[in-house]
């Protein structure tokens, strides 16, 4: 709980925000968890704390580890953990999966690609953008504020996009790069009221206590590109991100598939180390688009670890 993964490349700037949000201006103390050593606040240090931010200027592979932040007040201290991994720079063009931020989808009408994490940095426009390691050139590409706009998007525009910018700290400049995949959606088609293919309404899913369990929410919304379509899981009517149980997570990103020409999305709910209290929760698969929302409810039941065969 209150833990966040952050990653960066050696010799680049990396800025991490304390996962335990307070309000601005509160005192935040940072520690290197393995040694419980306090992170200095003096900016002359390569790694230093600045309020809710932990700054690596620049980062080194040896900086990898878990950092503890404590938002302090006289009556209520709040602790968070930043799991930081610094990787060596790749010699080739390929960006490995572990360096990729979440995938974004675009269409002819909407083709913004936001540069991940950029809001944490002190940067000035323009951003540099690369696709599959090639600098983007031509009038179709416009770097605007913290995002890239592609005019007249085509299927060929799908790929890995890297933004590169300079972070400035007290007159010193540090390079930062961040990469995410971009997929292109077909514009032609139609939209329907969502149809949930799985799970069935009021389905009972058998799980084993102590084991992992997966629930898949799958729904179709029409044919071709859908302007607004989403599937998600809720626990007791609350979004997974707000529910605050780290053992229960939605799979990052939604998979779009085309079944018999239909545009379908699925979202996998992963429950690690199933506990008794998980059986008491109501799991709702929600599918929504411009036509409305459909909900299928699932409950978990205990499955005996040993199956008895006659």
């Amino acid at each position: 709980k209150f833990s966040k993964q952050s990653w960066g490349l050696e010799n680049e700037a990396l800025i991490v925000r304390c996962p335990r949000q307070g309000k601005p201006s509160y005192t935040v103390d940072w520690y290197y968890s393995q040694t419980n050593k306090s992170i200095p606040t003096q900016e002359r240090n390569r790694v230093f704390a600045s309020g809710q931010l932990l700054k690596f200027l620049p980062a080194a592979v040896a900086d990898s580890g878990i950092y503890t932040c404590i938002v302090r007040s006289p009556t209520f201290n709040r602790t968070g953990y930043a799991n930081v991994t610094i990787y060596k720079k790749q010699s080739d063009c390929n960006v490995p999966d572990y360096l990729m931020y979440s995938t974004v989808s675009g269409s002819e009408k909407n083709s913004k690609i936001y540069c991940p994490t950029i809001d944490l940095y002190n940067w000035t426009a323009p951003l540099e953008w690369f696709k599959n390691c090639q600098a983007l050139q031509g009038s179709r590409y416009r770097a605007h504020k913290s995002f890239l706009v592609i005019d007249n998007v085509m299927t060929e525009d799908a790929g890995d996009y890297t933004c590169k910018f300079i972070h400035n700290e007290n007159g010193a400049n540090y390079s930062v790069t961040a990469t995410r995949s971009f997929t292109v959606k077909d514009e032609q088609g139609f939209s329907l009221f969502p149809v949930i293919g799985a799970p069935a309404q009021n389905e009972i899913k058998e799980v084993e206590i102590g084991k992992n369990a997966n629930l898949t929410c799958s729904a179709c919304f029409g044919k071709g590109t859908q302007f607004l379509a989403a599937v998600l899981w809720q626990l007791n009517g609350t979004k997974i991100t707000d529910f605050g149980e780290p053992r229960i997570q939605q799979e990052e990103g939604q998979n779009q598939s085309f079944s018999n020409g239909l545009a379908c999305l699925d979202m996998v709910l992963r429950i690690a180390d199933v506990k008794e209290e998980d059986l008491l929760l109501q799991y709702d698969c929600l599918a929504l688009n411009l036509h409305g929302l459909r909900r299928h409810t699932v409950r978990l039941s205990r499955k005996n670890p040993i199956d008895h065969h006659s």
Partner: antibody, heavy 117, light 111 residues
Framework: QVQLQESGPGLVKPSQTLSLTCTVS?????????WNWIRQPPGKGLEWIGY???????TYNPSLKSRVTISVDTSKNQFSLKLSSVTAADTAVYYC??????????WGQGTLVTVSS | DIVLTQSPASLAVSPGQRATITCRAS??????????MHWYQQKPGQPPKLLIY???NLESGVPARFSGSGSGTDFTLTINPVEANDTANYYC?????????FGQGTKVEIK
């Protein structure tokens, strides 16, 4: 958007127990923060009753501690106030509110509880 | 318990003028470089609304006409310039220790 809504009987008899519930939407109360009860007698100022934090740990105002219990129902995303042995002096508008650290940034609309026979 | 005393109990201000409310604590509410004093606005029939936290920090979405200052035991909420819809009760609250306490309130009326 975080929203809080108080509910419970508007009239309680003296010596009985006042019971109120605060239903939270837009945020899971077990995710983080502290969840407070505050009251305001008609035409008077505010009095902090106590809070329960995301982990279920409670802190009460010593002036009411012997009569107060704050608890949480995670399945309904609600937290509750019980105030025993009430008297007319407990007549007030009761508010629930969220504390990020120690100021209260989201409040319910409040519910008036009258103690009368 | 820390007792918070607000003054004046009420004041009437013309639109465009400055309104100043003070809050005095029975002991210091400052420690470790911060002052744990907060200000709320309460309009009739509504719950309080957080205006200022940590003595001088403007809560998100609150107009910059509101400002707070002070440290130790003496704190001030200033509204400048006052507008017609600022008619309300204003409360200070400390969080230096348990229990949290509020001031008795100051009623601001617009002439």
């Amino acid at each position: 958007q975080v929203q809080l809504q108080e509910s419970g009987p508007g009239l309680v008899k003296p010596s009985q127990t006042l019971s109120l519930t605060c239903t939270v939407s837009g945020y899971s109360i077990t995710s983080d923060y502290a969840w407070n009860w505050i009251r305001q007698p008609p035409g008077k100022g505010l009095e902090w009753i106590g809070y329960i934090d995301y982990s279920g740990s409670t802190t009460y105002n010593p002036s009411l501690k012997s009569r107060v219990t704050i608890s949480v129902d995670t399945s309904k995303n609600q937290f509750s106030l019980k105030l025993s042995s009430v008297t007319a002096a407990d007549t007030a508008v009761y508010y629930c509110a969220r504390t990020v650290i120690d100021s209260m940034d989201y409040w319910g609309q409040g519910t008036l509880v009258t103690v009368s026979s | 318990d820390i007792v918070l005393t607000q003054s004046p109990a009420s004041l009437a201000v013309s639109p465009g003028q400055r309104a100043t409310i003070t809050c005095r604590a029975s002991k210091s509410v400052s420690t470790s470089g911060h002052s744990y004093m907060h200000w709320y606005q309460q309009k009739p029939g509504q719950p309080p609304k957080l205006l200022i936290y940590l003595a001088s920090n403007l809560e998100s979405g609150v107009p910059a006409r509101f400002s707070g200052s002070g440290s130790g035991t003496d704190f001030t909420l200033t509204i400048n310039p006052v507008e017609a819809n600022d008619t309300a009760n204003y409360y200070c609250q400390h969080s230096r220790e348990f229990p949290f306490t509020f001031g008795q309130g100051t009623k601001v009326e617009i002439k």
